[in-house]
C-alpha cells in the first residue's frame, strides 16, 4: 500500500530515509536538457526475498541533444552499496542499514539524474528527521516518522522533534545518525484523524522536470 | 559509470599547503553533499570537510578549520580543499565522497560525521612530513 501524503515539515530540520521498504518506487528523473533513454526504466523498485533486497530496474538518462549514441548508465547498485559497507568500518558508523530484513540502501547517483528524487513510499515506511547546521535538538520523543495505515487511510506520524537556533560549535546533540527500525515504535494515538503537511515543491524541480507518471515528491 | 576521481595528493613540508581535487562527471550537484573524508594509517576515517551543492553550505571538523577550505566548481563537476599550514597529523589518505541532500535540500553534518555515503572515490594520498 503506498503513502498518500508526504512525510510532515519540521521547521529547520531535514529527513532523509536510511533505507527503503520492500515495494517502494524511485521514479527515474533526469535534469533539464538530459531524458530517459528509449525503452529505459520509468522506476526503480526495491524487491527482494528473505536475505537479501535490491532495486530493480536501472535509470538511464542521455543528452536530449542526441539520438541514444551515448548511453549514461547507472552504478549497480549492489556494486556500489557493497563496497560503501566494506571500505567504511569505523565505530562512528551506525548498524549497517542495507542488514534490514525487506529493505534496500540509497541507490548510488546516476549520470544526469534529476536534483530531486520522487520516492513513493510504502505503509511501514521510516524516515529520520536532523536539525541542520547551525540548530540543535531538542527531543520529546522520537526524531522520526513511519507511514501507518489507519482506518483504510495512510498517514505519516509526527515526529516529536523541535529544532532551536542555539549554535554549537562543534557535534549538535541530538543530530547522530539514527539505527533504522523496521517497524515504527507503537503510538499511543487511537484518534482516525489524518493529518497532512504540504511539502514545498521546489519551483525550480517544477520546471526543469519531464512529466511524470507520478507526482509525490521526495528527495 | 559515475566516478569519483580524487587527485593532488603529495608529500609536502609542515607549514605547506596543497589543493585536492575530486571530480565527478556527470554528478548532479545540487542534490548532494560533496566533501571529503581522510584516514590516517591505524585509525579510522573521519569527515573532514563537505559543500553542498544545493545552497553551498560547509562543514569543517574542528582539527581543520581556519586552515582548509572547500570549494566547487560546477562547470568543471569538481569540488576542491584547499589545505594551508599543512600539520604531521594531516597525513593520510583522503577520499571524496558524495551523499544524497535530505528534504528540502537540506543537510545535516551528523549524516556526513556518520561516514555513510551513497559513493566514494579511491583516494589520494597526503603526506605532511619534513
Known amino acids: 500500500e503506498l503513502c498518500d501524503d508526504d512525510p510532515p515539515e519540521i521547521p529547520h530540520a531535514t529527513f532523509k530515509a536510511m533505507a527503503y521498504k520492500e515495494g517502494t518506487m524511485l521514479n527515474c528523473e533526469c535534469k533539464r536538457g538530459f531524458r530517459r533513454i528509449k525503452s529505459g526504466s520509468l522506476y526503480m523498485l526495491c524487491t527482494g526475498n528473505s536475505s537479501h533486497s535490491s532495486w530493480d530496474n536501472q535509470c538511464q538518462c542521455t543528452s536530449s541533444a542526441t539520438r541514444n549514441t551515448t548511453k549514461q548508465v547507472t552504478p549497480q547498485p549492489e556494486e556500489q552499496k557493497e563496497r560503501k559497507t566494506t571500505e567504511m568500518q569505523s565505530p562512528m558508523q551506525p548498524v549497517d542499514q542495507a542488514s534490514l530484513p525487506g529493505h534496500c540502501r540509497e541507490p548510488p547517483p546516476w549520470e544526469n539524474e534529476a536534483t530531486e528524487r520522487i520516492y513513493h513510499f510504502v505503509v511501514g515506511q521510516m524516515v529520520y528527521y536532523q536539525c541542520v547546521q547551525g540548530y540543535r535538538a531538542l527531543h520529546r520523543g522520537p526524531a522520526e516518522s513511519v507511514c501507518k495505515m489507519t482506518h483504510g487511510k495512510t498517514r505519516w506520524t509526527q515526529p516529536q522533534l523541535i529544532c532551536t537556533g542555539e549554535m554549537e560549535t562543534s557535534q549538535f546533540p541530538g543530530e547522530e545518525k539514527p539505527q533504522a527500525s523496521p517497524e515504527g515504535r507503537p503510538e499511543s494515538e487511537t484518534s482516525c484523524l489524518v493529518t497532512t503537511t504540504d511539502f514545498q515543491i521546489q519551483t525550480e524541480m517544477a520546471a526543469t522536470m519531464e512529466t511524470s507518471i507520478f507526482t509525490t515528491e521526495y528527495q | 559509470q559515475l566516478q569519483l576521481v580524487e587527485s593532488g595528493g603529495d608529500l609536502v613540508q609542515p607549514g605547506g599547503s596543497l589543493r585536492l581535487s575530486c571530480t565527478a562527471s556527470?554528478?548532479?550537484?545540487?542534490?548532494?553533499?560533496i566533501g571529503w573524508f581522510r584516514q590516517a594509517p591505524g585509525k579510522e576515517r573521519e569527515g573532514v570537510s563537505y559543500?553542498?551543492?544545493?545552497?553551498?553550505?560547509?562543514y569543517y571538523i574542528d582539527s581543520v578549520k581556519g586552515r582548509f577550505t572547500i570549494s566547487s566548481d560546477i562547470a568543471k563537476s569538481t569540488v576542491y580543499l584547499q589545505m594551508n599550514t599543512l600539520k604531521p597529523e594531516d597525513t593520510a589518505v583522503y577520499y571524496c565522497?558524495?551523499?544524497?541532500?535530505?528534504?528540502?535540500?537540506?543537510?545535516?553534518?551528523?549524516?556526513?560525521?556518520?561516514?555513510?555515503?551513497?559513493?566514494w572515490g579511491k583516494g589520494t594520498l597526503v603526506t605532511v612530513s619534513s
Open positions: 565522497a558524495v551523499d544524497r541532500l535530505g528534504s528540502r535540500g537540506l543537510y545535516a553534518s551528523s549524516w556526513w560525521r556518520s561516514g555513510d555515503m551513497d559513493l
Open positions: 556527470g554528478l548532479t550537484f545540487d542534490g548532494y553533499a
Open positions: 559543500i553542498t551543492g544545493s545552497n553551498g553550505s560547509t
